[in-house]
């Protein structure tokens, strides 16, 4: 309940907000949950705490893990958890699902794409924007404050948009990138019984103990904007939020993509630091809309290390 997922790329700045709120005068202490080690507040450290914020300047893959923040108020301490995953930079252009922020949709009248999480950073305009890894050029694109405006939106404008900016901390500059999908609302549409594209029914997913794992639940619901459509994960028939395991979180915000004109949603289940007991759980990908509910079940199995002979 008091846990938030955050992710970033190695060698980029990442700033994480404590999920618990309080007054500006309240003290906030941060700890690395696995070791219960206090995070320093001195800015000379690469990873340091600054009130409600935890700063990785820059982030490293080894920083991945669960961080605890405690907001100390006069009457009680409020504890929150930040589940941080730092990924290696991809060499190719594709931005994987697990690095995507929530999808936004636009129309001819409203085509603002906000740069995710930018409010946490000390940045100066202009923002750089890319679509499917290509720098955006031309008079139709206007970078304004923390968002991109596209004039005369067309269906071809749908795609993955990346914003890039520089965070400045005490005179040092750090790069930050964030990507989200943009969909264009189609006025003509229809809705179907949900079709789950992934995972396959009764799929067995191989995972390594101690590593992170991601499961993607992906389903399509028809064509055009869907008024009621959702995908979600359940563990042993229980909602993720009620299951109470902070290592296992589903990504907030659902990616709506129009592949082949179909309206599809994704929900990524992130399992941090896979444990033996995770292999005993039943993972259900649920897709539902006005027509009904479809469920695909996944189980995890241990990936056997491959012997390498010289």
């Amino acid at each position: 309940k008091f846990s938030k997922q955050s992710w970033g790329l190695e060698n980029e700045a990442l700033i994480v907000r404590c999920p618990r709120q309080g007054k500006p005068s309240y003290t906030v202490d941060w700890y690395y949950s696995q070791t219960n080690k206090s995070i320093p507040t001195q800015e000379r450290n690469r990873v340091f705490a600054s009130g409600q914020l935890l700063k990785f300047l820059p982030a490293a893959v080894a920083d991945s893990g669960i961080y605890t923040c405690i907001v100390r108020s006069p009457t009680f301490n409020r504890t929150g958890y930040a589940n941080v995953t730092i990924y290696k930079k991809q060499s190719d252009c594709n931005v994987p699902d697990y690095l995507m922020y929530s999808t936004v949709s636009g129309s001819e009248k409203n085509s603002k794409i906000y740069c995710p999480t930018i409010d946490l950073y000390n940045w100066t305009a202009p923002l750089e924007w890319f679509k499917n890894c290509q720098a955006l050029q031309g008079s139709r694109y206007r970078a304004h404050k923390s968002f991109l405006v596209i004039d005369n939106v067309m269906t071809e404008d749908a795609g993955d948009y990346t914003c890039k900016f520089i965070h400045n901390e005490n005179g040092a500059n750090y790069s930050v990138t964030a990507t989200r999908s943009f969909t264009v609302k189609d006025e003509q549409g229809f809705s179907l019984f949900p079709v789950i594209g992934a995972p396959a029914q009764n799929e067995i997913k191989e995972v390594e103990i101690g590593k992170n794992a991601n499961l993607t639940c992906s389903a399509c619901f028809g064509k055009g904007t869907q008024f009621l459509a959702a995908v979600l994960w359940q563990l042993n028939g229980t909602k993720i939020t009620d299951f109470g395991e902070p290592r296992i979180q589903q990504e907030e915000g659902q990616n709506q993509s129009f592949s082949n004109g179909l309206a599809c949603l994704d929900m990524v289940l992130r399992i941090a630091d896979v444990k033996e007991e995770d292999l005993l759980l039943q993972y259900d990908c649920l897709a539902l809309n006005l027509h009904g509910l479809r469920r695909h079940t996944v189980r995890l199995s241990r990936k056997n290390p491959i012997d390498h002979h010289s």
Epitope: K1, F2, K4, R17, P19, R20, Q21, G22, K23, P24, S25, Y26, T27, R72, S73, P74, T75, G80, D119
Partner: antibody, heavy 116, light 113 residues
Framework: QVQLVQSGAEVKKPGASVKVSCKAS????????MNWVRQAPGQRLEWMGW????????TYGDNFKGRVTITRDTSASTAYMELSSLRSEDTAVYYC?????????WGQGTLVTVSS | DIQMTQSPSSLSASVGDRVTITCKSS????????????LAWYQQKPGKVPKLLIY???TRESGVPSRFSGSGSGTDFTLTISSLQPEDVATYYC?????????FGGGTKVEIK
């Protein structure tokens, strides 16, 4: 500049529900909690509850538990307060107020009149 | 719940007078963790929205005239208007900003003689 704009006045019958909205602008909505305070005619201010706008966790005053529901929509930078099972003594001006050291920013208020 | 008791409930003073309003809380509003007193003072004019004057018992909110000052610690607090002006006619409320439920005093109505 920081602005909190509330929905318009409402007239409701006893037993009904009312939902008041509070749209925030001029700051990052999820950085600050949002409180709800009401004031009946000629009465003192009365705190109803607040919501953690980042994770959506509400906290309610004991006098309102079970009748009030505070929610938020981060994409619209809007907080909502719904009060159910209305009675005549719920006639009041309802305010949203941004959390901070004291409440420095208030909505303009929404008058809810409960009358049969 | 923390009870907030204000006195007087109303007062009438002349322009230029020094006006003092007191507020007592049923529990201490001092937080030992940072030595802050979580008490706020508001001004509310008829038909208007409350306006924050003082927070932390003694810190004046930005833009508030210097004739308004707050003092006190623990359970006893005071709002002082050093030289009453016609535009100060209003009801003044103290607020427990320390713990839930945040509670307000009954108000002090200030009028000009």
């Amino acid at each position: 500049q920081v602005q909190l704009v509330q929905s318009g006045a409402e007239v409701k019958k006893p037993g009904a529900s009312v939902k008041v909205s509070c749209k925030a602008s001029g700051y990052t909505f999820i950085n600050y909690g949002m409180n709800w305070v009401r004031q009946a005619p000629g009465q003192r201010l009365e705190w109803m509850g607040w919501i953690n706008t980042y994770i959506g966790e509400p906290t309610y005053g004991d006098n309102f538990k079970g009748r009030v529901t505070i929610t938020r929509d981060t994409s619209a930078s809007t907080a909502y307060m719904e009060l159910s099972s209305l009675r005549s003594e719920d006639t009041a001006v309802y305010y949203c107020a941004r959390e901070g050291e004291g409440f420095a920013y208030w909505g303009q208020g929404t008058l809810v009149t409960v009358s049969s | 719940d923390i009870q907030m008791t204000q006195s007087p409930s109303s007062l009438s003073a002349s322009v230029g007078d020094r006006v003092t309003i007191t507020c007592k809380s049923s529990q201490s509003l001092l937080y030992s963790g940072n030595q802050n007193n979580y008490l706020a003072w508001y001004q509310q004019k008829p038909g208007k929205v409350p306006k924050l004057l003082i927070y932390g018992a003694s810190t004046r909110e930005s833009g508030v005239p210097s004739r308004f000052s707050g003092s006190g610690s623990g359970t006893d607090f005071t709002l002082t208007i050093s030289s009453l002006q016609p535009e100060d006619v209003a009801t003044y409320y103290c607020q427990n900003d320390h713990s839930y439920p945040y509670t307000f005093g009954g108000g002090t109505k200030v009028e000009i003689k």
